[in-house]
């Protein structure tokens, strides 16, 4: 069975949108008007993972690109990257752990926890135009809360 997916955009809790910054990086910044078309559209796939009553495992691919957000160790630190995959084999229901995020809904906001690195979250900085990264703290300066906007296929 094909994996169930939906197209969406994400904005952080300060309403910053996510856009491409070079071929393998995302950054967060405020967009308005026609500039909104720059924001990346994700294909969010519902995959196997350590699902709980509070957490739904998903993979976040870039729509119509063979790129997926993944979490790996770089210099001994959990790091968020965009990873290129073989489009013939992805998305799939049984994604490797580094591609899986636990989608957590709290008070109408979403968090995306790395399955590979528990308690590390997709994060943005307070500052404008900074890279999207994997952060190990919640409730501090960095932003870990997002809203999701559905995009029609």
């Amino acid at each position: 069975a094909p994996v169930r997916s939906l197209n969406c955009t994400l904005r952080d809790s300060q309403q910053k949108s996510l856009v491409m910054s070079g071929p393998y990086e995302l950054k967060a910044l405020h967009l308005q008007g026609q500039d909104m078309e720059q924001q990346v559209v994700f294909s969010m796939s519902f995959v196997q993972g350590e699902e709980s009553n509070d957490k739904i495992p998903v993979a976040l691919g870039l729509k119509e690109k063979n790129l997926y957000l993944s979490c790996v160790l770089k210099d001994d630190k959990p790091t968020l990257q965009l990873e290129s995959v073989d489009p013939k084999n992805y998305p799939k229901k049984k994604m490797e752990k580094r591609f899986v995020f636990n989608k957590i809904e709290i008070n109408n906001k979403l968090e995306f926890e790395s399955a590979q690195f528990p308690n590390w979250y997709i994060s943005t900085s307070q500052a404008e135009n900074m890279p999207v990264f994997l952060g190990g703290t919640k409730g501090g300066q960095d932003i870990t809360d997002f809203t999701m906007q559905f995009v029609s296929s």
Epitope: A1, Q48, E50, D54, K93, K94, M95, N102, P118
Partner: antibody, heavy 122, light 107 residues
Amino acid sequence: EVQLQESGPGLVKPSETLSLTCTVSGFSLSDYGVSWIRQPPGKGLEWIGLIWGGGDTYYNSPLKSRLTISKDNSKSQVSLKLSSVTAADTAVYYCARQTNLWAYDLYSMDYWGQGTLVTVSS
Amino acid sequence: DIQMTQSPSSLSASVGDRVTITCQASTDIDDDLNWYQQKPGKAPKLLISLGSTLRPGVPSRFSGSGSGTDFTFTISSLQPEDFATYYCLQSDRLPLTFGQGTKLEIK
């Protein structure tokens, strides 16, 4: 060798809380999920819920409001608590290990305990 | 939740017979289907995972096939120790769900 062993009172009164412990050996609870399954006398198997290596839980809907699964990794023990029991909760209760093979076979249960019969009666 | 429909519910057969049990899922589960054997007073034992993968130590007379919604479990030549109850389990998504079971009895 992987082993799981359920223990707890064999008799529980209606409206009370059923408490069971699953003690494991041969693997670490921080690396594997553990499920609970039950089987009423002469009937089929019903999956109750599980606790993952990281401690997150998934409870099956029919029992969700009455169920708590927790664990102590250092003691290699998983516990199940089911509140407000009735005669319908009389069953053999099993714990079982999740295969935990990411991107291959995450949700299967490969090793089971021998089970413990719990009777709900006054 | 995914419903698993297993048939037959009971089956009488003789030693040496070929026996087939089927399991049907209410939705496509790819190959995420397991078969368990349970003997009276014992815990279920995993025989086959991922539809057709024989677990280590399980005799080759047991086999599984199928994908999607329709699955088959076969014992090619029944042995006396095979008389037991067999269950299918879908491991595609939570909550995990079992078939109703098939009791295999001596004819």
